[in-house]
């Protein structure tokens, strides 16, 4: 792939977008104080004005934009002011507000439920395969294999808690050492960040919104990848996580605690268990090489069972196989012994949709995967719509100020750390980092939360999920307590180490810059978002997995040249932007490479051809399909429901520019009308102030 997606002849033009430069956008004059960010991540050196004419930080020829695309949109209130309303209007407005709140909570509820069902669907589709990944004996000796197994398994089961609980059970039954488990935990941390990235894809309809949402989601990915990139070699060399956690576990005499409180599950379980119920023990059993488990279904059929322990007579090949000498006898031909057996009697069937269908796991999983994604997408669209109509004018100003404004000097630096605590606390309450970060994504998209603020919230979420794991570990039975606690602590200290690496010093907040860069690319070439998802969460881990299975010689033989090329490109890129004069003329830009190696334009043409849209028509039957279609064919504008958009962007033909961002419109609703997304509504009836 290209070192940077677009590397043409560079012209220092501060009014143009930088397509790939990790979020280094020209700074626009501040329109409103509320978008001011104190914890600015950008280093002064990288400002566009300072780039020499021969720099390779290419600027795309686009119409001049006054605004920084990363500035939050101004959500203006076009409705009648509260003071100007009559009593009837006020009452109507009040009930409208209550109605919206109820709708918002309802959609939020189904959004969280669909995430839960999405996880179940993934487990049904890939859970058994995930379990088999764990039964690979090379994990013990190859930390890289452990890492990718952690990623793949968590992506396949859509739940880091499932993959970590498998690891815990494997460690406590001595199938895995804590040392071998640490890379898997790191991988699980990466894998869990796919959920909010998938959620971000649902906001593909609006380029500006998508840019922010996708960047906000991938900041989690980049944090995890970068942390692993640095901390895995450190761990392999020093075993610091293993040593620290071992010391902690050994220095405390832990008593078995109580289970971590299931706060959100209490509300969502009654609904999700009506859809499907899974027997998660099956995945663990497969991971622990239980042959019988391979033929078991993950779909739970019996919910009420009676377990009776009894002793039965069984034949054994010889007296040596007897349970004990005193429990050994013969009938003259065969040797017999007495075995304790647990007899399971099925009493009552589970009450869920798939209980009587007897469909294969793959079929149930596929059905649920499609349905949950549709519900997820639908809920997300509705949440964004409701929030868009509620968060306007004063309400928006108050919320944005509260969330995005820093503490007064000299305590500004504390704001981010408070956000980390809030993220951790919220994740602890909802018991899932995926749920928290997925709920955060649309808020970043519509511009309520800045990426700079979302970043510490996400980091906090990473911490929150580990505190849940620590509590769950303390509730483990005696034999699993030590191992589960040590693994939970490894997870905790890994995230703490990551935060220390990529948060305290603004300059080191690389994940923000990288996420912004990816947001820019994905807003321009929306198919790249899917491409990124497949590459980072499937292809790279699967390639490493395959190479690891082929042996370490093959892994090193392929890996070393690849790593060398990446380092070479990064060094060259750094020299091009910082001190190009030291480079030969030819290497001062990327023009020496063929276009397909330095730009996404040719790839865009290929993708467009493959999807059959040719960027001219984008047919759809419903809003959800429309969004999916827009994502695949990169249709410039999202079509109206039940209609086709045929070359809606004639005015912009030949120009690779983002659709006019909603911030230039009075409010989101109006902006969407202009983009042909929603039917026009009488703005006078809008009620925003509660």
């Amino acid at each position: 792939m290209a070192p940077w997606p677009e590397l043409g002849d560079a012209q220092p033009n501060p009014d143009k977008y930088l397509e790939g430069a990790a979020g280094q956008q020209p700074t626009a004059p501040d329109k409103s104080k509320e978008t001011n960010k104190t914890d600015n991540t950008e280093a002064p050196v990288t400002k566009i004005e300072l780039l020499p004419s021969y720099s390779t930080a290419t600027l795309i020829d686009e119409p001049t934009e006054v605004d920084d695309p990363w500035n939050l949109p101004t959500l203006q209130d076009s409705g009648i002011k509260w003071s100007e309303r009559d009593t009837k209007g006020k009452i109507l407005c009040f009930f409208q507000g209550i109605g919206r709140l109820i709708l918002l909570l309802g959609f939020l509820y189904f959004f969280v439920c669909s995430l839960d069902i999405l996880s179940s669907a993934f487990q049904l589709v890939g859970g058994k395969m995930a379990g088999q990944f764990f039964s690979n004996s090379s994990i013990m000796s190859n930390p890289l294999l452990g890492l990718v197994i952690g990623v793949l398994v968590t992506v396949l089961v859509q739940s880091s808690s499932t993959s970590t609980s498998i690891v815990v059970s494997m460690v406590s039954s001595s199938l895995l050492t804590v040392r071998a488990a640490i890379p898997i935990i790191m991988g699980a941390n990466i894998g869990t960040s796919i959920t909010n990235t998938i959620v971000a894809l649902m906001q593909v309809g609006d380029r500006s919104e998508f840019r922010r949402a996708f960047a906000g989601a991938t900041v989690h990915d980049f944090f995890n990848w970068l942390s692993v990139l640095v901390l895995l070699p450190v761990e392999v060399a020093t075993h610091y996580l293993e040593i620290i956690t071992q010391l902690i576990v050994e220095s405390f005499h832990f008593k078995n605690g109580e289970d971590a409180p299931d706060l959100l599950k209490v509300i969502t379980k009654p609904f999700t268990k009506l859809i499907v119920q899974l027997d998660k023990k099956v995945i663990s059993q497969i991971a622990m090489n239980d042959e019988k488990a391979k033929n078991k279904s993950l779909v739970k059929i019996w919910c009420k069972t009676f377990t009776n322990k009894t002793q039965i007579n069984v034949t054994v090949p010889s007296t040596a196989n007897c349970t004990s000498p005193s429990l050994c006898w013969t009938d003259g031909i065969q040797n017999w012994t007495m075995k304790n057996v647990t007899y399971k009697e099925n009493i009552a069937k589970c009450q869920h949709i798939f209980v009587n269908f007897h469909l294969p796991d793959l079929a149930v999983g596929t059905i649920l995967l499609i349905l949950s994604l549709l519900v997820l997408c639908g809920c997300l669209i509705m949440i964004v719509k409701i929030l868009g109509s509620v968060l306007k004018g004063q309400v928006a100003t108050v919320i944005k100020k509260t969330i995005n404004t820093d503490f007064p000097f000299p305590f500004a630096w504390l704001t981010g750390y408070l956000a980390i605590l809030v993220g951790a606390g919220m994740t602890f309450i909802v018991q899932s980092s995926s749920v928290f970060t997925s709920a955060l994504t649309p808020l970043i998209g519509i511009g309520v939360i800045t990426i700079e603020r979302a970043y510490p919230l996400t980091l906090g979420s990473n911490i929150g999920t580990t505190t849940t794991a620590i509590l769950a570990a303390l509730a483990s039975p005696g034999n699993a307590l030590r191992s589960s606690l040590q693994i939970a602590l490894c997870h905790f200290f890994f995230n703490i180490s990551g935060i220390l690496l990529w948060y305290p010093i603004p300059f080191t907040r690389l994940p923000i810059r990288m996420a912004k860069g990816l947001g820019n690319i994905s807003a321009k070439y929306r198919w790249f978002a899917v491409f990124y998802l497949i590459i980072f969460f499937f292809l790279i881990p699967l390639t490493v997995f395959g190479l690891s299975l082929a042996g370490w010689r093959v892994l090193v033989g392929v890996g070393v040249p690849v790593v060398f090329i990446i380092i070479l490109v990064l060094c060259l890129r750094l020299l091009q932007s910082r001190c190009p004069r030291v480079l030969p003329k030819k290497l001062q830009n990327w023009n020496f490479l063929p276009l397909w190696m330095r730009s996404l334009k040719p790839w865009d043409a290929v993708v467009s051809k493959f999807t059959g849209c040719f960027q001219m028509r984008c047919c759809c039957c419903c809003r959800v399909c429309c969004r999916a279609c827009c994502l695949l064919c990169d249709c410039p504008k999202c079509c109206r429901c039940s209609k086709c958009c045929e070359d809606l962007e004639e005015a912009q033909e030949g120009q690779d520019v983002p659709v006019k961002a909603p911030e230039t419109f009075d409010n989101i609703t109006i902006s969407r009308e202009a983009q042909g997304e929603v039917p026009a509504s009488d703005s006078k009836t809008e009620c925003t102030a509660l």
Epitope: N313, T319, P325, S326, L327, C328, W329, T330, D331, G332, I333, Q334, N335, W336
Partner: antibody, heavy 120, light 107 residues
Framework: QVQLVQSGAEVVKPGASVKMSCKTS????????MHWVRQAPGQGLEWIGA????????SYNQKFKGRVTLTADKSTSTAYMELSSLRSEDTAVYYC?????????????WGQGTLVTVSS | DIVMTQSPSSLSTSVGDRVTITCKAS??????VAWYQQKPGQSPKLLIY???TRHTGVPDRFTGSGSGTDFTLIIRSLQPEDVATYFC?????????FGSGTKVEIK
Amino acid sequence: QVQLVQSGAEVVKPGASVKMSCKTSGYTFITYNMHWVRQAPGQGLEWIGAIYPGSGDTSYNQKFKGRVTLTADKSTSTAYMELSSLRSEDTAVYYCSISTIITTGAVDYWGQGTLVTVSS
Amino acid sequence: DIVMTQSPSSLSTSVGDRVTITCKASQDVGTAVAWYQQKPGQSPKLLIYWTSTRHTGVPDRFTGSGSGTDFTLIIRSLQPEDVATYFCQQYSRIPLTFGSGTKVEIK
């Protein structure tokens, strides 16, 4: 009721073989193990071996291995024991017996016995 | 092979007396022990299996006990029809082995 009827007494010369039968009735022949036990005059009981008629599986006392052959004919519900290379110490009453107490070697039904006299 | 040592080899007692016959196994046989009664000129008859379980039709004056290596058969109140030779048997290991027998007579 369960009945085990054994063949009549035999007088054989040393070195010869003897084959005795045990005809059963009153139960399903293939269900239970058939044991063969002998008792020398004025002596204790000695287990020779057993056969499971259902599969033909056999088990022998190491002392008799190579000299004894146990067989079963399912069609006639009859068990057979053949003892070769007879010696004078093989003179005894030979009993066939079954164990209806599943999985145990405790035999609860016995035949009347076949007296084998080894004499030159 | 497991050797079953039975004692006494014979005993003479009166009707109504309590009779105790012991059997010692050369190694642990758990509870896989049976007791047989053989009257002169007859085939043996199963009295007790699994050390203490009476076979159907066996009077309750016959009681078995023990485990491991030491086993006992008790005839609580000797009756004239109990005159016979009593054998213990282990079925813990192949080959099945019997005790040498205890001859019970009435004075």
